[in-house]
């Protein structure tokens, strides 16, 4: 059974992940972003179901494509290099989903834009956090 300290750690990691995803969304989904139109042409796979931490496997598998799209953005728009940012997210995702069980991600039929993709995972984090508090 999860202890209060492990629940608190999970909550903090989810909050960190949430802020990272929101920061990326803020950097992209902005009328001042010269590459927004181009970025919106890239398609991302969405999870068929995302209600548990193990479903973060679906996010992990899309981190490489996410990094590639972020590389399009002008460097002056990004405080952190995309590689560093995605690396930070990857570390948190691995810790949250755990590595002891292998989970095969199931994707929805419809693909999504980067904005829809980020919003979906932001909602996921908020939902899990709300169950922990």
């Amino acid at each position: 059974a999860p202890t209060s300290s492990s629940t608190k750690k999970t909550q903090l990691q989810l909050e960190h992940l949430l802020l990272d995803l929101q920061m990326i969304l803020n950097g992209i989904n902005n009328y001042k972003n010269p590459k927004l139109t181009r970025m919106l042409t890239f398609k991302f796979y969405m999870p068929k179901k995302a209600t548990e931490l193990k479903h973060l496997q679906c996010l992990e598998e899309e981190l490489k494509p996410l990094e590639e799209v972020l590389n399009l953005a002008q460097s002056k728009n990004f405080h952190l290099r995309p590689r560093d940012l995605i690396s930070n997210i990857n570390v948190i995702v691995l810790e949250l989903k755990g590595s002891e069980t292998t989970f095969m991600c199931e994707y929805a039929d419809e693909t999504a834009t980067i904005v829809e993709f980020l919003n979906r995972w932001i909602t996921f984090c908020q939902s899990i956090i709300s169950t922990l508090t």
């Epitope: 920061m23 803020n26 902005n30 009328y31 001042k32 139109t37 405080h79 932001i122």
Partner: antibody
Framework: QVQLVESGGGVVQPGRSLRLSCAAS????????MHWVRQAPGKGLEWVAV????????YYVDSVKGRFTISRDNSKNTLYLQMNSLRAEDTAVYYC?????????????WGQGTLVTVSS | DIVMTQTPLSSPVTLGQPASISCRSS???????????LSWLQQRPGQPPRLLIY???NRFSGVPDRFSGSGAGTDFTLKISRVEAEDVGVYYC????????FGQGTRLEIK
Amino acid sequence: QVQLVESGGGVVQPGRSLRLSCAASGFTFSSFGMHWVRQAPGKGLEWVAVIWFDGSNKYYVDSVKGRFTISRDNSKNTLYLQMNSLRAEDTAVYYCARDDFWSDYPFDYWGQGTLVTVSS
Amino acid sequence: DIVMTQTPLSSPVTLGQPASISCRSSQSLVNIDGSTHLSWLQQRPGQPPRLLIYKISNRFSGVPDRFSGSGAGTDFTLKISRVEAEDVGVYYCMQTTQFPTFGQGTRLEIK
């Protein structure tokens, strides 16, 4: 001094069209992004559309996408909003506002507004 | 879209007394470069809006120093240290971190 003057408002029937203009003076118009913001009678502010300084990018609020078109003529220092398929809910005072994308302050100067009334 | 929620919606204040307006965003407004694009606008009766504060706490040119802004992340506050008669109107918070959205507005009136 910076001046923005809107015109083109009036009473129009639902489904009809209207074109608003915003004449700019007192600054280098071609260096600034421009927005349209509207305010329904007795209500709050709603962002409508933005156009880049060079006209290269245009974005709209969902409720006007496919009906409204923002454009600009930098040689005439004028911003436009072409409004088609007008609805009762488009009734509002329409303001143009300036935005220096590369500075820290957005929406730093506003026009006095022009009233659009959509009614049968 | 980012939703901006202001409280209170109406604020009756005595002349010379302080006033405070809160604004909360539905998600963090911190950008990837560390900046936070949260502004405050004033709209006097019958007038267009006017920029007061940008990037949380910076006063725009010509704005009296009795106006100040503070906050971080998702919670922001506009304070007027001593309300004057000319401060009557509606105050809006606005975020431009993503596509612009405004709070519902807070009406400042004199008691």
